[in-house]
């Protein structure tokens, strides 16, 4: 059979070999495509329901006036000439649709250096068969699945048209000290060869590196957190960066209701003191940052101050 | 809202003529084939006439073939049917539908237009 | 000429009842068959198409159904709205051949 590709809405002419150029003509056309179940027969005397999509004309070629998707299949002419000389003809019609250009939405202006971010979601709609997106950094391919580079695909069908919309979602973790303005832009490949593919206008978000965190230290005295019942134990919040973040307190994991401060002062040690204690640094450009936790405790007068205190009770302390 | 609205049906002498328009709104008229089918009083539906969108090919059943004309303005978004010669067993109501090929049959009526051949 | 034989040509039903009508074509139509609906006064309704395609704001309880050359129509569960006059129609060649009718009446 010989192969057709046609575009969707438009005309096709199927020619019937060796058929009379005019009328009368011992010819008949076979269909068998969607809109068929089995063969359906058309001839010239023909004429009906049938001419919206397929009539056969005077010459005896099969005339679509608009090609659709229902029209893919096998179209088969068998014609006798004057002599009684029987030609078939065989013809395979696919069909296509190249969509509008696609575009990205939803773009990120911005991504972060060493960890995941959305660049943006490639969008074609209009398609037929669906054809496929890829995205390309710096005019190269990206492959998913490398190099953290992550690819979240769907496609839909428009039910009325049976055309194709896909959508494809990237997401990259940037490298440190890597491009500062990298230049992503999508393309759609049809599903059809010999069509080129089709590629978005590119777009250049910002790569923002994160200053690395330096630890929060929390310093407890006296050293190892263990007290005399009355004695005095002082916190110290202590945080690099710049500016100086908010500071706040807990106690066995529960945040304790005291303003900011970067120094906790429990005077005069009870009961209710001991606890685990830690402290939270809040950055305005990272988020909360927590210190490692430190045990303070009671140790009654010959006994030996532990490096780990036991559970604590529910007293507040000041705040330096 | 799609809507067909016939109009032209009346009291006509056996010979006589009658010309039927439909109007039509709330879709796209060029690109449908419209239909003319009748119903004779007390009787079942009877295909009457179609048209293909352009207006470029007509077809009919026997019982009205060189006596009929089907034909449409899209631009006017209108169709018509050219009734000559008429008989007795032409009385029926007529109505105007959408479609009439194998891309959608008849999906859209009107509400109707009686046509009354006596003498 | 593509003869559509309809049958029953009238028949009496009850509120509740399942209903079946059925046409058959003289020969292969395809999957080209619409059903209608009419009732006294009133143009057809579509409510089939392409054979088992259900129209928009048809109800559910209606169906179509394809055996070779014979179609059929199915009310689930009359209701008394039900009540009318059903036709088929073959549009797979001309001249487009309605079925002769089916009368649903009340019991």
């Known amino acids: 059979a010989q192969n057709i590709t046609a575009r969707i809405g438009e005309p096709l002419v199927l020619k019937c070999k060796g058929a009379p150029k005019k009328p009368p003509q011992r010819l008949e056309w076979k269909l068998n495509t969607g809109r068929t179940e089995a063969w359906k027969v058309l001839s010239p005397q023909g004429g009906g329901p049938w001419d919206s999509v397929a009539r056969v004309l005077p010459n005896g070629s099969l005339f679509l006036p608009a090609v659709g998707i229902q029209d893919e299949g096998i179209f088969r002419c068998q014609a006798m000439n004057r002599n009684g000389k029987e030609t078939k003809s065989n013809y395979r019609v696919r069909v296509y649709q190249i969509p509008g250009k696609p575009e990205i939405v939803d773009s990120a202006s911005e991504l972060t250096a060493g960890v995941p971010n959305k660049v943006g979601t490639c969008v074609s709609e209009g398609s037929y068969p669906a054809g496929t997106l890829s995205w390309h950094l710096d005019g190269k391919p990206l492959v998913p699945n490398e190099k953290g580079v992550s690819v979240k695909e769907q496609t839909r069908r428009h039910p009325e048209t049976g055309l194709f919309t896909l959508q494809s979602e990237l997401m990259v973790t940037p490298a440190r000290g890597g491009d500062p303005r990298p230049t992503f832009s999508c393309s759609f490949s049809p599903g059809l060869p010999r069509h080129r593919a089709l590629r978005t206008a590119p777009i250049q978000p910002r790569v923002w590196e994160p200053v690395p965190l330096e630890e929060v230290q929390l310093v407890v005295e006296p050293e190892g957190g263990a007290v005399a019942p009355g004695g005095t134990v002082t916190l110290t919040c202590e945080v690099p960066a710049q500016p100086s973040p908010q500071i706040h307190w807990m106690k066995d994991g529960v945040p304790l209701p005291l303003p900011p401060s970067p120094v906790l002062i429990l005077p005069e040690i009870g009961p209710q003191d001991q606890g685990t204690y830690s402290c939270v640094a809040t950055h305005s450009s990272h988020g909360p940052q927590e210190s490692r936790a430190v045990s303070i405790s009671i140790i009654e007068p010959g006994e030996e101050g532990p490096t780990a205190g036991s559970v604590g009770g529910s007293g507040l302390g000041t705040l330096a | 809202e799609v809507q067909l609205v016939e109009s032209g049906g009346g009291l006509v002498q056996p010979g006589g003529s009658l010309r039927l328009s439909c109007a039509a709104s709330g879709f796209t008229f060029n690109n449908y084939w419209m239909t003319w089918v009748r119903q004779a009083p007390g009787k079942g539906l009877e295909w009457v006439a179609s048209?293909?969108?352009?207006?470029?090919?007509?077809y009919y059943p026997d019982s009205v073939k060189d006596r009929f004309t089907i034909s449409r303005d899209n631009a006017k978004n209108s169709l018509y049917l050219q009734m000559n010669s008429l008989r007795a067993e032409d009385t029926a109501v007529y109505y105007c539908?959408?479609?009439?090929?194998?891309?959608?049959?008849?999906?859209?009526w009107g509400q109707g237009t009686l046509v009354t051949v006596s003498s | 000429d593509i003869q559509m034989t309809q049958s029953p040509s009238s028949l009496s039903a009850s509120v509740g009842d399942r209903v079946t009508i059925t046409c058959r074509a003289s020969?292969?139509?395809?999957?080209?068959v619409n059903w209608f609906q009419q009732k006294p006064g009133k143009a057809p309704r579509r409510l089939i198409y392409?054979?088992?395609n259900l129209a928009d704001g048809v109800p559910s309880r209606f169906s179509g159904s394809r055996s070779g050359t014979d179609f059929t129509l199915t009310i689930s569960s009359l209701q008394p709205e039900d009540f009318a006059t059903y036709y088929c129609?073959?549009?797979?060649?001309?001249?487009?051949?309605f079925g002769g009718g089916t009368k649903v009446e009340i019991k």
């Open positions: 129609l073959e549009f797979d060649e001309h001249p487009l051949t």
């Open positions: 020969q292969d139509v395809g999957i080209y």
């Open positions: 392409r054979a088992t």
């Open positions: 539908a959408r479609g009439g090929d194998i891309r959608v049959g008849l999906d859209v």
């Open positions: 048209i293909d969108n352009s207006g470029d090919n007509t």
